[in-house]
């Protein structure tokens, strides 16, 4: 099946202090390689979460990515702050034999818009 990375929401709004879920699904797990979430693009992009076991404060996976045939790579960001605003991308990589993993597909991005906490 052709690989497609889908981020169904163009944007989400969240009040500061709340949590938000950023959805991402894949149509195929092939080729073999990790899925990572970034905020921003190009040289200024920031790694937000990687489904490879590292610990990322405030960010967790929504479903069990270790389950066989799991195609859901959504994440939850907790205790959102204004600094979390930006566009988030779910990116699929192909594992290289020795060289670094190659970025092969990306979701269309989900903008996180942080609203002031209601007083």
């Amino acid at each position: 099946k052709e690989l497609k990375v889908t981020q169904p929401e163009k944007s989400v709004s969240v009040a500061a202090g709340d949590s938000t879920v950023l959805n991402c699904t894949l149509t195929s797990l092939l080729p073999v390689g990790p899925i990572k979430w970034y905020r921003g693009v190009g040289q200024s992009r920031l790694l937000i979460y990687s489904f490879t076991g590292e610990h990322f404060p405030r960010v967790t996976n929504v479903s069990d990515a270790t389950k066989r045939n799991n195609m859901d790579f959504s994440i939850r960001i907790s205790n959102v702050t204004p600094e979390d605003a930006g566009t988030y991308y779910c990116v699929k990589f192909q594992k290289g034999p020795s060289e670094p993993d190659t970025e092969i597909q990306s979701g269309g991005g989900t903008e996180v818009y942080v609203l002031a906490k209601p007083s």
């Epitope: 169904p8 163009k10 944007s11 709004s13 693009v41 190009g42 566009t87 597909q105 990306s106 269309g108 991005g109 903008e111 818009y113 609203l115």
Partner: antibody, heavy 119, light 108 residues
Framework: DVQLVESGGGVVRPGESLRLSCAAS????????MNWVRQAPGEGLEWVSL????????YYADSVKGRFTISRDNSKNTLYLQMNSLRAEDTAVYYC????????????WGLGALVTVSS | ETVLTQSPGTLTLSPGERTTLTCRAS??????LAWYQEKPGQAPRLLIY???SRATGIPDRFSGSGSGTEFTLTISSLQSEDFAVYYC??????????FGGGTKVEIK
């Protein structure tokens, strides 16, 4: 049929204000994000601002931030652009554009409203 | 922000000719790219989205291709109504949404 009709354009002096309106019909207005895009004489297209269907999420181009305000009245199927502190470089045809429901490209445009800022 | 560069700036062609317009992005936008046609006194019209998908009602003489940073719009046989200005737009890196500077296709 989708229709977008801009109004409110005209000639103003630098520093003055103007409000553009865009009357929408032929689709469920409140379900779609809407944008303003402008084109200065002899120049290309420049994105100005966007507002989500609910009105909760708003973005502006740096060139108009702090001077322009986008808003919408879903009960009237109308999009607005309040333009304050107008400058000569704001002279352009302003288009109202409806977004696709999944991605931020524009599937329908209005004919545009001409704004001329001149002393 | 992602800068889009369109080339050439102007094309002077005859009806029936085939032409290819190019749009280059300063960084990868994958296939998140659209093409529009603009004619004087008319609303801009969406031609292509997703780099290669034709919008509703667009004739099949228009085709788009490319991914990453290099994209093309091809008109297989120019009709009189195709003489216009064409713009590409990326919707991957945002905000802001950015457009190319446009390519004018004029009649010889």
């Amino acid at each position: 049929d989708v229709q977008l009709v801009e109004s409110g354009g005209g000639v103003v002096r630098p520093g003055e204000s103007l409000r553009l309106s865009c009357a929408a019909s032929g689709f469920t207005f409140s379900s779609y994000d809407m944008n303003w895009v402008r084109q200065a004489p002899g120049e290309g297209l420049e994105w100005v601002s966007l507002i989500s269907g609910s009105g909760e999420i708003i973005y502006y181009a740096d060139s108009v931030k702090g001077r322009f305000t986008i808003s919408r009245d879903n009960s009237k199927n109308t999009l607005y652009l309040q333009m304050n502190s107008l400058r000569a470089e704001d002279t352009a045809v302003y288009y109202c554009a409806k977004e696709d429901n999944r991605y931020r490209f524009f599937d329908y445009w209005g004919l545009g409203a001409l704004v001329t800022v001149s002393s | 922000e992602t800068v889009l560069t369109q080339s050439p700036g102007t094309l002077t062609l005859s009806p029936g000719e085939r032409t290819t317009l190019t749009c280059r992005a300063s960084q990868s936008v994958y296939t998140y790219l659209a093409w529009y046609q603009e004619k004087p006194g008319q609303a801009p019209r969406l031609l292509i989205y997703g780099a290669s998908s034709r919008a509703t009602g667009i004739p099949d003489r228009f085709s788009g291709s490319g991914s990453g940073t290099e994209f093309t719009l091809t008109i297989s046989s120019l009709q009189s109504e195709d003489f216009a200005v064409y713009y590409c737009q990326q919707y991957y890196d945002r905000p802001p949404l950015t457009f190319g500077g446009g390519t004018k296709v004029e009649i010889k």
